[in-house]
């Protein structure tokens, strides 16, 4: 009789583990299913947020014709003010017009005032030409007007209403820039 | 978390050409821009070309004019394809995923340029 009660008593106490494993399963899938639903409409949230605020640049951004421009607020060294730019989709201004020009310094006056502000445009070692990161020629009236006299890697930068240049490892704040999202409408 | 595969590395003459993939899996919405570094023995890793979610693209001085980075329509797999190779082009090529938060590495491939 007691070999009897001990065994159900076993059997009684494997059934209750089951079903705390089973329990501890379903509150593992809720969790899961919780956290899921909070990434859908988090995504959901943002996409509807896009959809509506369907604004050609991001928040903090200036723009002008299909450019959309970001002035930063930290100091970095070219390489880094590039990846910066990257982590945000976009890349180092590249100046293409004198109009274009007109319109960064006049934003920067409104903005800053006088400070250096890195661009995509660096020299290159052995042939000394100037290029814009994607390996184009500045145009002739868009070339820094001093030449570094520095043996290290070169750099352009804005200043007020001037492109000058500088040191690569030196620190700046820097401009980035991307295209301006073409409304749908 | 985003997931980086390399591919295309190998042994090429000066001159020569190669063509190297990076296909992108995970969080892929989460990127911004995609590119790729080298990194020389004893050398730090250096940014060769990249491009953004836009299409705007950014080449180290080093391969301005020899290397061209795109990718596909789907947006996901970045090419670089390296024309007129030089010994000094010889490092191991890592893709690198550029987000707001984290950046993301691959393994790297090797690109050895030698006669």
């Known amino acids: 009789k007691l070999l009897q009660v001990s065994t159900i008593a076993m059997q009684q106490q494997e059934k209750l583990i089951q079903q705390e494993r089973a329990l501890l399963n379903f509150t593992e899938w809720k969790r899961s299913c919780a956290l899921q639903m909070k990434y859908c409409q988090a995504f959901m949230q943002n996409s509807l947020s896009s959809a509506h605020n369907s604004s050609p640049c991001p928040n903090n951004w200036i723009q002008n014709r299909e450019s959309c421009y970001y002035v930063s607020e930290i100091w970095s060294i070219w390489h880094t003010s590039q990846e910066n730019c990257l982590k945000e989709g976009s890349t180092l201004l590249q100046i293409e017009s004198k109009e274009e020009m007109d319109f960064i310094t006049g934003s920067l006056r409104k903005i800053k005032g006088s400070y250096d502000y890195w661009v995509g445009l660096s020299q290159d070692g052995h042939s000394g030409r100037w290029l814009w990161q994607d390996g184009s020629s500045p145009s002739p009236g868009l070339l820094p007007a001093e030449r570094s006299q520095s043996a290290n890697q070169v750099c352009g930068y804005v200043k007020s209403n001037s492109l000058l240049s500088s040191n690569c490892s030196t620190w700046k704040y820097f401009i980035c820039e991307k295209y301006a999202l073409r409304s749908s409408v | 978390q985003v997931q980086l595969q390399e591919s295309g590395g190998g042994l090429v003459q000066p001159g020569g050409s190669l063509r190297l993939s990076c296909a992108a899996s995970?969080?892929?919405?989460?990127?911004?821009?995609m590119g790729w570094y080298r990194q020389a023995p004893g050398n730090q890793r250096e940014l060769v070309a990249a491009i953004t979610n836009g299409g705007r693209t950014v080449y180290g001085d080093s391969v301005k004019g020899r290397f061209t980075i795109s990718r596909d329509s789907a947006g996901n797999t970045v090419h670089l394809q390296m024309d007129s190779l030089r010994p000094e082009d010889t490092g191991v090529y890592y893709c690198?995923?550029?987000?707001?938060?984290?950046?993301?590495w691959g393994q790297g491939t090797q690109v050895t340029v030698s006669s």
């Open positions: 995970g969080g892929i919405s989460s990127i911004n821009s």
């Open positions: 690198k995923a550029f987000t707001r938060g984290d950046d993301y």
